[in-house]
């Protein structure tokens, strides 16, 4: 069972990404990840989280925003935004620490 080692009861989440096996998944929490790769439009992925809850606490940057929630289908209608573009002298702060 691929979700056996998750903390606590499992929740059902909306799954919308190229790697989803169906419209929903089950995990320890629900996720929304907004990612903008260089030269591309931002893409929003919805799914399940089982590892590295610390990602949920990371600050949004101009490249990525992570959102997590803990109830049934709680990630279904969430829309995220990225931070405003940083000055060119600054590096993107993707390190969540």
């Amino acid at each position: 069972d691929p979700v056996k080692p998750s903390r606590g009861p499992l929740v059902t989440c909306t799954c919308e990404s190229p790697h989803c096996k169906g419209p929903t998944c089950r995990g320890a929490w629900c996720t929304v990840v907004l990612v903008r790769e260089e030269g591309r439009h931002p893409q929003e992925h919805r799914g399940c989280g089982n590892l590295h809850r610390e990602l949920c606490r990371g600050r949004p940057t101009e490249f990525v925003n992570h959102y997590c929630c803990d109830s049934h289908l709680c990630n279904h209608n969430v829309s995220l935004v990225l931070e405003a573009t940083q000055p060119p002298s600054e590096q993107p702060g993707t390190d969540g620490q």
Epitope: H19, L51, T94
Partner: antibody, heavy 118, light 108 residues
Framework: QVQLQESGPGLVKPSQTLSLTCTVS??????????WNWIRQHPGKGLEWIGY???????YYNPSLKSRVTISVDTSKNQFSLKLSSVTAADTAVYYC??????????WGQGTLVTVSS | EIVLTQSPGTLSLSPGERATLSCRAS???????LAWYQQKPGQAPRLLIY???SRATGIPDRFSGSGSGTDFTLTISRLEPEDFAVYYC?????????FGQGTRLEIK
């Protein structure tokens, strides 16, 4: 079958930057189920976790190395990379990349020895 | 930061005997994310056990894991010649990822 392969120089001069790349085959680095890690092992010693990157580009690093480490991902090439700056002889080690899932570090590269010497 | 301490440092046993390796955490941890690895000289570590007690794909059933809270155990019920190696426990799945210092299992 998922495979990971480390590549990069085997010899780095002191004070320079160590750069390694891990190429993933047989699976997508963009899957949200996985986290992509670097680990090292000094000669005759135990395993030391360096840090991980998620497909989104978010990173977490070992606090003892954080000031010198950068991990990046290139999803288009299915690769992730390690840079370790200001190296000294103490950074001589075998460097491994590994995939992390709910089932632990289930796939590892074979490891590459990096020697820091002038 | 949680520290994992493995004991003994070296374990000397003969083929056919039972091996019991210990991993103790400095504070209580989730048993969902405790793994064991085997490493032989010149090779990468190999995943044996994840989630404290689940065997990884292809791992013989003579390997078993147990424990909770702060105390975890890897048991090899009947040692085969190929089992003599170094074994590491690990906490994964949350920051920071940590490894124990290893137990060397050697032939007596």
């Amino acid at each position: 079958q998922v495979q990971l392969q480390e590549s990069g120089p085997g010899l780095v001069k002191p004070s320079q930057t160590l750069s390694l790349t891990c190429t993933v085959s047989g699976g997508s680095i963009s899957s949200g189920e996985y986290y992509w890690n670097w680990i090292r092992q000094h000669p005759g010693k135990g395993l030391e976790w360096i840090g991980y990157i998620y497909y989104s580009g978010s990173t977490y690093y070992n606090p003892s190395l954080k000031s010198r480490v950068t991990i990046s991902v290139d999803t288009s090439k299915n690769q992730f990379s390690l840079k370790l700056s200001s190296v000294t002889a103490a950074d001589t080690a075998v460097y491994y990349c590994a995939r992390e899932s709910v089932a632990g570090f289930d796939y590892w590269g074979q490891g590459t020895l990096v020697t820091v010497s002038s | 930061e949680i520290v994992l301490t493995q004991s003994p440092g070296t374990l000397s046993l003969s083929p056919g005997e039972r091996a019991t390796l210990s991993c103790r955490a400095s504070q209580s941890v989730s048993s969902s994310y405790l793994a064991w690895y085997q490493q032989k000289p010149g090779q990468a570590p190999r995943l044996l056990i994840y989630g404290t007690s689940s065997r990884a794909t292809g791992i013989p059933d003579r390997f078993s894991g147990s424990g909770s809270g702060t105390d975890f155990t890897l048991t090899i019920s009947r040692l085969e010649p190929e089992d003599f190696a170094v074994y590491y426990c690990q906490l994964y799945g949350s920051f920071p990822i940590t490894f124990g210092q290893g137990t060397r299992l050697e032939i007596k």
